[in-house]
Amino acid sequence: ILGGREAEAHARPYMASVQLNGAHLCGGVLVAEQWVLSAAHCLEDAADGKVQVLLGAHSLSQPEPSKRLYDVLRAVPHPDSQPDTIDHDLLLLQLSEKATLGPAVRPLPWQRVDRDVAPGTLCDVAGWGIVNHAGRRPDSLQHVLLPVLDRATCNRATHHDGAITERLMCAESNRRDSCKGDSGGPLVCGGVLEGVVTSGSRVCGNAKKPGIYTRVASYAAWIDSVLA
């Protein structure tokens, strides 16, 4: 997260850290007792590694009573996700067992109504991704409030040049933005999960390259079918 600040500890009990061989790799969001939603690209290079999900965490390194690391029983990338595109960049991770719920671990309701979030709406994005251009990685969860950007502006030739389909949304990125390591994390508007940070590589904090988020409402049928 660029230009953000440390989050209030455990105030986002849905927040997950998707880890590869014990290191934070991507964000994720608990959407059901045994399921975490993240980004498909996160596991592209994880073929030989051990993927786990950390729930109930604020600090990645310090002991916390609510922290627990779960093994992954099953990883289900969206069937249409591809390495070279940002489209359909969703991944569902089934935990080895149901998460122990409590004040610091709680699923987040996700948007099912397939309507665009109004431009200008302030949404919260959180993560353990890098916080500067030298790769400074935070130990504690960071967050930032970002205004939703209309699709027409985001699709300008100077911005994302038509790449933003109806299944994607954008948020402003002028010095405040999601960045490497935040991919797969939640974009929350009005207490509801609206988007998932895409993991396409791009510059962070540049106003002309807005943050791109996968709209979960557009994938409700797929999410329901996997969780069923």
Epitope: N21, A23, L25, R137
Partner: antibody
Framework: QVQLQQPGAELVRPGTSVKLSCKAS????????MHWVKQRPGQGLEWIGV????????NYNQKFKGKATLTVDTSSSTAYMQLSSLTSEDSAVYYC???????????WGQGTSVTVSS | EIQMTQTTSSLSASLGDRVTISCRAS??????LNWYQQKPDGTVKLLIY???RLHSGVPSRFSGSGSGTDYSLTISNLEQEDFATYFC?????????FGGGTKLEIK
């Protein structure tokens, strides 16, 4: 356990270049950025720059732009720093260090001592 | 760039003593302060980051504190292996910068 292996010493001629290596083991190489730090004899430490092994993105201290070039070889989990147009001012110990939390460097190599002499 | 100043370049102490090493930044570094130990053979180890979190494997006799521009490293109950040089480093603003070091010697 995390290990960063660096050769002990390099003796080089003024005006030439040298490529220093740092072989990482005990962790997933592409998951952590790698810093390089310079220490002149009897002096403090200077941050040279950092590289992200996952995509070779670099960020340099302005002072070392044009002097140092950072690269990686992910197949061998090795980070490299090339120093060019060497002068006596470049005689120093050069460390590689893994990116830790909150701007720290959590594991360091033993350092390579570079001596520039004719 | 941010200047990091360790006013004490050397410090003498005895085994079992408690010592405090200080570090001052030329501007607020928002707690992004880290401490390193360098042994005479050149080996460097991270001790503490942000500015009171103990790195894994570091003995609990090491502790850090501070905020804004002023930070300190405290070593209680000094042991033989603690006699070394200690550097502070700010990780708030690029380029990252280090203090000049404080050499801890046996009295």
């Amino acid at each position: 356990q995390v290990q960063l292996q660096q050769p002990g010493a390099e003796l080089v001629r003024p005006g030439t270049s040298v490529k220093l290596s740092c072989k990482a083991s005990g962790y997933t190489f592409t998951s952590y950025w790698m810093h390089w730090v310079k220490q002149r004899p009897g002096q403090g430490l200077e941050w040279i720059g950092v590289i992200d092994p996952s995509d070779s993105y670099t960020n340099y201290n302005q002072k070392f732009k044009g002097k140092a070039t950072l690269t990686v070889d992910t197949s061998s989990s090795t980070a490299y720093m090339q120093l060019s147009s060497l002068t006596s001012e470049d005689s120093a110990v050069y460390y590689c260090a893994r990116n830790g939390y909150d701007g720290s460097m959590d594991y360091w190599g033993q350092g390579t001592s570079v001596t520039v002499s004719s | 760039e941010i200047q990091m100043t360790q006013t004490t370049s050397s410090l003498s102490a005895s085994l079992g003593d408690r010592v405090t090493i200080s570090c001052r930044a030329s501007q607020d570094i928002s707690n992004y302060l880290n401490w390193y130990q360098q042994k005479p053979d050149g080996t460097v180890k991270l001790l503490i980051y942000y500015p009171s979190r103990l790195h894994s494997g570091v003995p609990s006799r090491f502790s850090g504190s501070g905020s804004g521009t002023d930070y300190s490293l405290t070593i209680s109950n000094l042991e033989q292996e603690d006699f070394a040089t200690y550097f502070c480093q700010q990780g708030n603003t690029l380029p990252y910068t280090f203090g000049g070091g404080t050499k801890l010697e046996i009295k």
